[in-house]
């Protein structure tokens, strides 16, 4: 079957990194500079992705695979294949249209990207707050007050390292 297919379509013999050149009697020609073909039997090579602006090259283009970009320091990737870069913020902040802003009281962000999220409401699960939340960290929920009756093994909640973060906005 493979031989029959080859007789019918000489292009099927062209491996990745080459293209089937119609101008040269369907000879397999290497992809020109700054282009690639990741599969065999292709009639054209694709142009390599360039990493410009705030993108930087994570992986160089080769004759068989496209270049891959990531973001320069201070930015992080968004989307499949790092289709765009977004400014980093510090932990405890979120990116708004006016730049990086501290999380409001009752919210936190433990990453350099994304939005501030509300602290977990421990009481919804019938639990108590073991460690207070901050701008950078969620609260830690502990056993419910009823679980802390005499004789039950209890964990003494450590004093919070500092007051929960608060930012008037």
């Amino acid at each position: 079957f493979e031989r029959t297919r080859s007789l019918q379509d000489p292009c099927s013999n062209c491996p990745a990194g080459t293209f089937c050149d119609n101008n040269r009697n369907q000879i397999c020609s290497p992809c020109p500079p700054n282009s690639f073909s990741s599969a065999g039997g292709q009639r054209t090579c694709d142009i390599c992705r360039q990493c410009k602006g705030v993108f930087r090259t994570r992986k160089e283009c080769s004759s068989t695979s496209n270049a891959e970009c990531d973001c320069t320091p201070g930015f992080h990737c968004l989307g499949a294949g790092c289709s765009m870069c977004e400014q980093d913020c510090k932990q405890g902040q979120e990116l708004t249209k006016k730049g990086c802003k501290d999380c409001c009281f009752g919210t936190f962000n433990d990453q350099k990207r994304g939005i501030c999220r509300p602290w977990t409401n421990c009481s919804l699960d019938g639990k108590s707050v073991l460690v207070n939340g901050t701008k950078e960290r969620d609260v830690v929920c502990g056993p419910s007050p009823a679980d802390l009756s005499p004789g039950a093994s209890s964990v003494t909640p450590p004093a919070p390292a500092r007051e929960p973060g608060h930012s008037p906005q």
Epitope: R49, A80, S83
Partner: antibody, heavy 119, light 107 residues
């Protein structure tokens, strides 16, 4: 086939606000950046701002900071552009446009929405 | 913000080559795209990422971008190419800038 369908023409009074919608169909909505571009009569294209629905954060051109708000509703695959404190110079055709995934081109455009600001 | 400058108008005889320039500080360090817009219609992407042509765009459209200038070249210009052309730049973030536009007249 990707399509962006915008809401109809609007006539507004100076000082008021307008909200234009852009409904996407035929493709993944949340991973593509949607931008808003306006064109005043006889003038050029002007980028106002954009949003990536799946990530929520919007960005705006300096000129429109504080006056434009761009949002997206993933459940209906619809993007919105609200422009406040309208003045006569805001009379224009407003387009939504989708950025191709990995490159910088706007490969799909809405049909445009004419907003007329007149007292 | 980078500012993009285009000539207001360019004229070309049918079958000849039209070149439309777009200049801006270190424009070659960023991605350039080009759009064609005919009266009463939405813009159409003709070149993206400096020199790439979307499917369906004729081969006579090509682009380049280096130094401070991006150029849209239309070889063998046809009457149907008469339109306004806009350059646009992108730095990789959610931020874009358009040039002022060039009216291409096919004589």
């Amino acid at each position: 086939q990707v399509q962006l369908v915008q809401s109809g023409a609007e006539v507004k009074k100076p000082g008021s606000s307008v909200k234009v919608s852009c409904k996407a169909s035929g493709g993944t909505f949340n991973s593509y950046a949607i931008s808003w571009v306006r064109q005043a009569p006889g003038q050029g294209l002007e980028w106002m701002g954009g949003i990536i629905p799946g990530f929520g954060t919007a960005n705006y051109a300096q000129k429109f900071q504080g006056r434009v708000t761009i949002t997206a509703d993933e459940s209906t695959s619809t993007a919105y552009m609200e422009l406040s404190s309208l003045r006569s110079e805001d009379t224009a055709v407003y387009y939504c446009a989708r950025k191709n995934e990995e490159d910088g081109g706007f490969d799909h455009w809405g049909q445009g929405t004419l907003v007329t600001v007149s007292s | 913000d980078i500012e993009l400058t285009q000539p207001p108008s360019v004229s070309v005889a049918p079958g000849q080559t039209a070149r439309i320039s777009c200049s801006g500080d270190n424009l070659g360090d960023y991605y350039a795209s080009w759009y064609q817009q005919k009266p009463g219609q939405a813009p159409v992407l003709v070149i993206y990422d400096d020199s790439n042509r979307p499917s369906g765009i004729p081969e006579r459209f090509s682009g380049s971008n280096s130094g401070n200038t991006a150029t849209l070249t239309i070889s063998g210009t046809q009457a149907e190419d008469e339109a306004d052309y806009y350059c646009q730049t992108w730095d990789g973030t959610l931020h874009f800038v358009f040039g002022g536009g060039t009216k291409l007249t096919v004589l």
